[in-house]
């Protein structure tokens, strides 16, 4: 026995209060499939949400976020506050990225700079809060005959080559020592920060709302939750 409601198309509902007739969806409601016994209430884009697509009798409204906010979640169920490049959103608002991290977008979290030495490369351009470091060619790339594109260099006397090699090795050693020193320094600082957290605590700065930006670097502990500083749910 066929259900009489199966004949009702999208944009209508099977009104079992009126002998199963197909009635059009009332204002501010829709049915995206046929055979429905009721229509769904249209989504309303209010407050920080704005209407991207109006509701019709067969499809729901779609929302996005007002300027200064971006969508989060399926179908833009939340609007989260934008931050500047070089910042991330924390519970206390926008905070600058810590030294050694960057964020090149208005959303998301600060990510660590690329460690060029892990790929055996050198730092060509230093990182900033907004940009990652640019890694340069590795020492092997600089060695003679490594590049097939570079035309062969004119022959030099053996003494000159030895000088160049000595200089290159000295520079490489100095760079490696510097990297080791910096790594050790970071480890010691991290240890001191864990051991004596009160030394590094930021003085409390009162905010006038989630939208206010903070000058202090975010430097989140691993257990601190990300986001949650300026989210608005529909």
């Amino acid at each position: 026995l066929q259900d009489p409601c199966s004949n009702c198309p999208a944009g209508t509902f099977c009104d079992n209060n009126r002998n199963q007739i197909c009635s059009p969806c009332p204002p501010n409601s829709f049915s995206s499939a046929g055979g429905q016994r009721t229509c769904d209430i249209c989504r309303q884009c209010k407050g920080v949400f704005r209407t991207r697509k109006e509701c019709s009798s067969t499809s729901n409204a779609e929302c996005d976020c007002t300027p200064g906010f971006h969508c989060l979640g399926a179908g833009c169920s939340m609007c989260e506050q934008d931050c500047k490049q070089g910042q991330e959103l924390t519970k206390k608002g926008c905070k600058d990225c810590c030294f050694g991290t960057f964020n090149d977008q208005k959303r998301g979290i600060c990510r660590p700079w690329t460690n060029c030495s892990l790929d055996g490369k050198s730092v060509l351009v230093n990182g900033t809060k907004e940009r990652d470091v640019v890694c340069g060619p590795s020492p092997a790339d600089l060695s003679p005959g490594a590049s097939s594109v570079t035309p062969p260099a004119p022959a030099r006397e053996p003494g000159h080559s030895l000088q160049v090699l000595t200089l290159f090795l000295a520079l490489t050693s100095a760079l490696l020592l510097a990297l080791i020193f910096i790594t050790l320094l970071f480890s010691v600082l991290k240890w001191i920060r864990k051991k004596f957290p009160h030394i590094f605590k930021q003085p409390f700065k009162k905010t006038t709302g989630a939208a206010q930006e903070e000058d202090a670097c975010s430097c989140r502990c691993p257990q601190e939750e990300e986001g949650g500083g300026g989210g608005y749910e529909l």
């Epitope: 509902f13 079992n16 209060n17 009635s23 009332p26 016994r37 009721t38 229509c39």
Partner: antibody
């Protein structure tokens, strides 16, 4: 804010018909169906019927077809249910409740009127 | 008429418990199942409609599930105000019919 206001109690003599009222406010009265539901002491809920105020279209539960008559007064946004020849079996709490259309749920309920049929 | 059966007429639980109330329809009702709460003073409120959709203002500790003929209401982390009677109701076919109710009592 949506409200369905019902008198708290009504006393009626057996055999004398009674008209229960339900005054709606806080929404467009003509856009929602008004339903009536019966609950006998310590028992479950029974749907009596509904009426669409816009055109007074009604549906009745067969069990109450000869007992209840549903009407509305659009000017005062009030729905009525008249019970004919009441007996002690009709002593119960009567709720008015609304839904939008189709198979929508009863999203707002009145406080209920306790009807006592007694001589 | 579609018969709605709530097999458990009363249920005892403690604060913080998770309870599930079941409801069975005599035929497939295609998810058109609503849940209501009735307080001891007689006040009735809609909790969940179309099987699992939370009515506005209802706490998220209430949830609904089911399909075909079998449906359930779950209350997680019971609070004092949740001790009441719960009714299921089908919106698939006229006449609208209700389950007999499940009274949730404090242990």
């Amino acid at each position: 804010q949506v409200q369905l206001q019902q008198p708290g109690a009504e006393l009626v003599r057996p055999g004398a018909s009674v008209k229960l009222s339900c005054k709606a406010s806080g929404y467009i009265f003509t856009s929602y169906w008004i339903n009536w539901v019966k609950q006998r002491p310590g028992q479950g809920l029974e749907w009596i019927g509904n009426i669409y105020p816009s055109d007074s279209y009604t549906n009745y539960n067969q069990k109450f077809k000869d007992k209840a008559t549903l009407t509305v007064d659009k000017s005062s946004s009030t729905a009525y249910m008249q019970l004919s020849s009441p007996t002690s079996e009709d002593s119960a709490v009567y709720y008015c409740t609304r839904f939008h259309y189709g198979s929508s749920p009863f999203d707002n309920w009145g406080q209920g009127t306790t009807l006592t049929v007694s001589s | 008429d579609i018969q709605m059966t709530q097999s458990t007429s009363s249920l005892s639980a403690s604060l913080g418990d998770r309870v599930t109330i079941s409801c069975r329809a005599s035929q497939d009702i295609s998810h058109y199942l609503n849940w209501y709460q009735q307080k001891p003073d007689g006040t009735v409120k809609l909790l969940i409609y179309y099987t699992s959709r939370l009515h506005s203002g209802v706490p998220s500790r209430f949830s609904g599930s089911g399909s075909g003929t079998d449906y359930s209401l779950t209350i997680s982390n019971l609070e004092q105000e949740d001790f009441a009677t719960y009714f299921c109701q089908q919106g698939h076919t006229l006449p609208r019919t209700f389950g007999g109710g499940t009274k949730l009592e404090i242990k």
